[in-house]
């Protein structure tokens, strides 16, 4: 598997591929240290408290959305804003919280994940190496027949993070996007300055998993700003 | 299959321009990095530049900065290089080259054009 | 930039013979982002090696890449007639990518 490589969203690519000791789930893997590709990978932090802004859902944590904060207000200006609960009204799945899908206008309960059990057809391309099963990569469609799918694997080059298997999302790897592990709680997250600085990122990270947000890491309190380290932590 | 078509190659005067086009098909288009290498008649490989997945972020190598474009359109999922100011040295086959997504290695390559710039 | 310098240019073997194949990086390839590509006249490049050791998507496993930092080497454990080409290292660690000069494989 490329656990060790794509761990804490991969930043180190694929070298000990598999089986190789490039990190640890639990470690907090730095940023492709030496890359060095012009404006590439600059992973800015600020205070915790600002607002997160994003371009998409797949930018927010597993309990965000990517909205505009003011109803009616400037499309242009979007932040991660908190799930609606159950019951609430939402205009598409994403605004609901995990467990819960929008149907008819309100978050309800999804029991065995409902909506995600849409008809999807598969798409699966091989790559990687000889040894490696990570090769299937999905897109999601709408068909008129049942059909059951392979979401991509860690590693699987990926549209969105819906194409990718639980656990993962799809982020930005070198100059193409493919599945990386959600954030486990104490690895290294990236805070965004402002919207669209991600896409300075040659290796971009997945959010935190669920219950996890990014935040400073108290013992960074003390460090300049530009040095602040953001971790995984519970809310 | 992955199937990378290159076209628009062929003879121009030096500092005249060119447009080469990358047709791709047999895969997710708007999910891969693509490249630009190029080979002088025998000679060896020369990088000259990538898009991002989206087009949002391009690179290229110092030998073609500021007189060579890269773009793409992921609606009809083509890659253009748009030369201008060609120079005697540009003379070279283009490939157009996918990215491996894990890796910046290319796993899928045009079967190339042939740019020649002559007077 | 990093310059990869391949050697020998050109190796001459016989099939069923081991090749080693060098290139070596004028600074550190960060994080072994090392790829090997093997070319034969008038075909575009093949993918054999990428992240210096992982063979790409249908490559025999008579191909093999190793090494760090600077020092890497492709071996073909028994060459076969159709491996008698040119191949190129690149690295993808720092910008620009670059490839090595090229090494010939010919038939003894």
């Known amino acids: 598997t490329l656990n060790s490589v794509l761990n804490s969203n991969a930043i180190k690519n694929l070298p000990p591929p598999l089986g190789g000791a490039a990190g640890h789930p639990g470690s907090a893997v730095s940023a492709a240290p030496g890359i060095l590709y012009p404006g590439g990978n600059k992973y800015q932090t600020i205070d915790n408290y600002q607002p997160y802004p994003c371009a998409e859902d797949e930018e927010c944590g597993t309990d965000e959305y990517c909205a505009s904060p003011t109803r009616g207000g400037d499309a242009g200006v979007q932040i991660c804003l908190a799930c609606r609960k159950r019951r609430k009204r939402c205009m598409r799945h994403a605004m609901c919280c995990p467990g819960n899908y929008c149907k008819n206008g309100i978050c309800v309960s999804s029991d065995q994940n409902h909506f995600r059990g849409e008809i999807e057809e598969t798409i699966t391309e091989s790559f990687g190496n000889d040894h490696s099963t990570l090769d299937g990569y999905s897109r999601r469609t709408t068909l008129s027949s049942k059909m059951y799918h392979t979401k991509g694997q860690e590693g699987s080059v990926c549209l969105r993070s819906s194409d990718c298997a639980s656990g993962l999302c799809c982020a930005r790897h070198f100059w193409s996007k493919i599945c990386k592990p959600v954030l486990k709680e104490g690895q290294v997250c990236t805070k965004h300055r402002r919207k669209g600085s991600h896409g300075l990122e040659i290796f971009q990270r997945c959010y935190c998993g669920e219950g996890l947000s990014c935040r400073i890491q108290k013992d960074h309190h003390q460090a300049s700003n530009s040095s602040r380290l953001h971790t995984c932590q519970r809310h | 299959q992955v199937q990378l078509v290159e076209s628009g190659g062929g003879v121009v005067q030096p500092g005249r321009s060119l447009r080469l086009s990358c047709a791709a098909s047999g895969f997710t288009f708007s999910s891969y990095g693509m490249h630009w290498v190029r080979q002088a008649p025998g000679k060896g490989l020369e990088w000259v530049a990538v898009?991002?997945?989206?087009?949002?972020?391009?690179y290229y190598a110092d030998s073609v900065k500021g007189r060579f474009t890269f773009s793409r359109d992921n609606s009809k999922n083509t890659l253009y290089l748009q030369m201008n100011s060609l120079r005697a040295e540009d003379t070279a086959v283009y490939y157009c080259?996918?990215?491996?997504?894990?890796?910046?290695?290319?796993?899928?390559w045009g079967q190339g054009t042939l740019v020649t710039v002559s007077s | 930039e990093i310059v990869l310098t391949q050697s020998p240019g050109t190796l001459s073997l016989s099939p069923g013979e081991r090749a080693t194949l060098s290139c070596r990086a004028s600074?550190?390839?960060?994080?072994?982002?090392l790829a090997w590509y093997q070319q034969k006249p008038g075909q575009a490049p093949r993918l054999l090696i990428y992240?210096?050791?992982s063979r790409a998507t249908g490559i025999p496993d008579r191909f093999s890449g190793s090494g760090s930092g600077t020092d890497f080497t492709l071996t073909i454990s028994r060459l076969e007639p159709e491996d008698f080409a040119v191949y190129y290292c690149?690295?993808?660690?720092?910008?620009?990518?670059?490839f090595g000069q090229g090494t010939r494989l010919e038939i003894k």
């Open positions: 080259a996918r990215e491996l997504g894990i890796a910046a290695s290319f796993d899928y």
């Open positions: 600074q550190s390839v960060s994080s072994n982002y």
């Open positions: 690149q690295q993808y660690g720092s910008s620009p990518i670059t």
């Open positions: 898009i991002s997945y989206d087009g949002s972020d391009k």
């Open positions: 992240g210096a050791s």
